[in-house]
Interface confidence: medium
């Protein structure tokens, strides 16, 4: 979690003098409670916007917007604390709006915005706006919170952001997998425009099981410039194990921008259809039924969200 360093955030507006300050997320009013405190924010909205840095990078940012309730408590409103918590790491970042003048009227609804929190693809955040001073112990809460889920790099608008491009989001390998005779798989994919090596990771599973029955890793050396954007064809030999028939092929690139941490793409080949034979009646009743019916072939990312389907 970090803040954009450019342009400098602004919270001043007509009728209000205000400055944005870094915050420790522990406002003084927690330690020294005040008697009279303002009401909570109204209509908190968080949206995904994008910001260009001075260096020309494009980053996803959380655009935070809220309004004030039209009550007399604005007379005691001294500012606001904005907090963003990344849920998977518990990392928190805060800023404070410090009002340098008093709000004295509601001629128009007061609206505040802040768009300087840089967020990461495929992460969930809790965004909280606290009005200051914070309430006395056991006082009514004067904050509003909302969760905010950032799309992953597969999303059209996220794909061109710097963090996504750095992890290889623009590379579409268009993987095809073909089952050959004599226990072989032919894997074909499109190389990216970088002289870097790739790894093909093959994991095979029995029908309807998630414990692997065969694993194999194949190294593909860095292509020459004339091979960029060309198809690479690799034939993998499978172990002759009856029933070890569902194969997941994962391609891991090692681009200079992401090294060992690049987005992987995978394709799955399902087991061939079984002929209809009467099943023996089990002498026990299973507690649950495994779900069946996967597609013949799918090309998807390493999180398993299907982003291409090809049937053959």
């Amino acid at each position: 979690l970090r803040l954009l360093d450019f342009p400098a955030p602004v919270c001043a507006q007509e009728g209000l003098s205000c400055r944005v300050k870094n915050s420790t997320c522990l406002d003084d009013s927690w330690i020294h409670p005040r008697n009279l405190t303002p009401s909570s924010p109204k209509d908190l909205q968080i949206q995904l916007h994008f910001a260009h840095t001075q260096q020309g990078d494009l980053f996803p940012v959380a655009h935070i917007e809220w309004t004030l309730q039209t009550d007399a408590s604005i007379l005691y409103l001294e500012g606001a604390e904005l907090s963003v918590l990344q849920l998977n790491t518990n990392e928190r970042l805060c800023v404070r709006f410090e009002f340098l003048s008093k709000l004295r009227h509601h001629h128009r609804r007061w609206r505040f915005t802040f768009s300087h929190f840089v967020v990461d693809p495929d992460q969930e955040y809790e965004v909280t706006v606290h009005h200051l001073p914070k309430p006395i112990p056991d006082g009514d809460p004067n904050h509003q919170s909302k969760n905010f889920l950032v799309p992953d790099c597969e999303h059209a608008r996220m794909k061109v952001t710097t963090p996504c491009m750095s992890s290889g989001s623009l590379w579409d390998p268009n993987i095809t997998v073909e089952t050959l005779e004599a226990h072989q798989l032919r894997v074909s994919f499109t190389l990216w425009n970088e002289s870097t090596h790739y790894q093909i990771l093959l994991t095979s599973f029995p029908h309807m099981e998630n414990h692997s029955c065969f694993e194999h890793m194949h190294h593909i050396p860095a292509p020459r410039p004339e091979e960029f954007h060309q198809r690479s064809n690799v034939t993998l030999t499978l172990r002759n194990l009856k029933g070890c028939c569902r194969h997941q092929v994962q391609i891991q690139p090692f681009f200079s921008s992401c090294l060992n941490d690049c987005l992987r793409h995978s394709a799955t080949v399902s087991c061939p259809e079984m002929p209809d034979t009467p099943e023996p009646i089990p002498d026990y009743m299973p507690l649950w039924e495994p779900r069946s019916g996967s597609s013949d072939y799918k090309d998807d990312d390493d999180k398993g969200s299907s982003h291409h389907h090809h049937h053959h």
Partner: antibody
Framework: QVQLQESGPGLVKPSETLSLTCTVS????????WNWIRQSPGKGLEWIGD???????NYNPSLKSRVTISVDTSKNQFSLKLSSVTTADTAVYYC?????????????????????????WGQGTTVTVSS | DILMTQSPSSLSASVGDRVTITCRAS??????LGWYQQKPGKAPKRLIY???SLQSGVPSRFSGSGSGTEFTLTISSLQPEDFATYYC?????????FGPGTKVDIK
Amino acid sequence: QVQLQESGPGLVKPSETLSLTCTVSGGSISNYYWNWIRQSPGKGLEWIGDIYYSGSTNYNPSLKSRVTISVDTSKNQFSLKLSSVTTADTAVYYCARDGELANYYGSGSYQFYYYYGMDVWGQGTTVTVSS
Amino acid sequence: DILMTQSPSSLSASVGDRVTITCRASQGIRNDLGWYQQKPGKAPKRLIYAASSLQSGVPSRFSGSGSGTEFTLTISSLQPEDFATYYCLQHNSNPFTFGPGTKVDIK
């Protein structure tokens, strides 16, 4: 209320460059993507490309070699240039704004959706390619 | 490119009928889909966003459903002003693509 207005010549000669401008009124061009879409006579809709207010562009690969989209934030305008036109480029050309995200809430708990899509359109301008 | 298909390509219906139009994507697009109505000589107008959310100002007789690859637009009780062509649009991955359209005319 944001409104979009396309402008430019209605007749372009084959092999020349088609140039159109979209003027945004009633709102800022900032923080949105701005799209060009076209519709050939009696045909469906085809997305040409888009531009972010900062100048970052995305183009339809089928037209990429001939398309340039640019933005002028000071005038609240964005423009389309399509080079080497043929009669197949005769169409109604629309500009459209890519909508902001919409958040809405399900029963008991929230559900947040990332939404982009064209929510505000210009009325369209007809461009005929003919000698 | 993601190919969007619509069915039927045209249909004839009467005022008061329930009308259902289906849109299919050639690969999963989550809920990144909108439905648009277009009348002759006019720009498309958005009816539904995020696959199932009703655009502000659009009558509640329009509804959308679906996720992934299959989506549906339903008009619960067709009105005279609903005779038009309807398009779906995926905005999940570039290039954004429209369905070929479904023309709804008077029976």
